[in-house]
């Protein structure tokens, strides 16, 4: 009867040894699960205030309204602009209306002067019919002035406040334009 | 340096359909307008369907508007032309087109 109880006695304090373990292994996670939660929340707190405190365009970009615009220092043809364009996240200009127009001629003006810049228009070789890169048609006003006599590829560019056409293989400085970073407050 | 590569073409007859691909290399394909031309025996090349850059805006030219559709996977680099309801008309080699730069073509007969 006494070994009966000592065995008893036994496997109740290993029992309880085994609930020590699994509370000691439960704290530890609990701390470790803490101590992570709180690693997330500073990274997010650096993330957001970091975000907050970064302006809506990247450096050497113009924003107006919702768009950031940024006008090349190097001459290429067209598709390598479109080409470096899309590497910094964006695409060639795509001019929606005659308020985006005015001020992009307007930025012009003030940074270059009278020179030749690619947008994102092409021309279809074929149906002859205009296209910005997304496959929206250029409204009635922002078709380009003149029909280029090139027998290649037509592409768009701006010059002073005209919408021009040439043909895509000379060289001229670009625009790339990309949304802006909205703030979240 | 740009290349387009087509394919799925074949003999097929009035009324049938037939899937086009087209592969395309060398540039970020995700960033232009794509189109789909054709060239019938003994006529020039002529402008068949266009889709934007994201897969919006898709056009036809009016001889095949409601039975050809254009779409493309930027995911894959693939633009698709799906041609139902054939007609002997739409014989012809078809090309997929970027700013001017075709593949070598894949050819579509429509034939009884």
């Known amino acids: 009867k006494l070994l009966q109880v000592s065995t008893i006695a036994m496997q109740q304090q290993e029992k309880l040894i085994q609930q020590e373990r699994a509370l000691l292994n439960f704290t530890e996670w609990k701390r470790s699960c803490a101590l992570q939660m709180k690693y997330c929340q500073a990274f997010m707190q650096n993330s957001l205030s970091s975000a907050h405190n970064s302006s809506p365009c990247p450096n050497n970009w113009i924003q107006n309204r919702e768009s950031c615009y940024y006008v090349s220092e190097i001459w290429s043809i067209w598709h390598t602009s479109q080409e470096n364009c899309l590497k910094e996240g964006s695409t060639l200009l795509q001019i929606e209306s005659k308020e985006e127009m005015d001020f992009i001629t307007g930025s012009l003006r003030k940074i270059k002067g009278s020179y030749d810049y690619w947008v994102g228009l092409s021309q279809d070789g074929h149906s002859g019919r205009w296209l910005w890169q997304d496959g929206s048609s250029p409204s009635p006003g922002l078709l380009p002035a003149e029909r280029s006599q090139s027998a290649n590829q037509v592409c768009g560019y701006v010059k002073s406040n005209s919408l021009l056409s040439s043909n895509c293989s000379t060289w001229k400085y670009f625009i790339c334009e990309k949304y802006a970073l909205r703030s979240s407050v | 340096q740009v290349q387009l590569v087509e394919s799925g073409g074949g003999l097929v007859q009035p009324g049938g359909s037939l899937r086009l691909s087209c592969a395309a290399s060398g540039f970020t394909f995700s960033g232009y307008v794509m189109s789909w031309v054709r060239q019938a025996p003994g006529k020039g090349l002529e402008w068949v369907a266009s889709?934007?850059?994201?897969?919006?805006?898709?056009s036809y030219t009016d001889s095949v508007e409601g039975r050809f559709t254009i779409s493309r996977d930027n995911a894959k680099n693939t633009l698709y032309l799906l041609m139902d309801n054939l007609k002997p008309d739409d014989t012809a080699v078809y090309y997929c087109?970027?700013?001017?730069?075709r593949g070598q073509g894949t050819q579509v007969t429509v034939s009884s």
């Open positions: 889709i934007g850059s994201g897969g919006g805006y898709p």
């Open positions: 087109e970027m700013l001017g730069r």
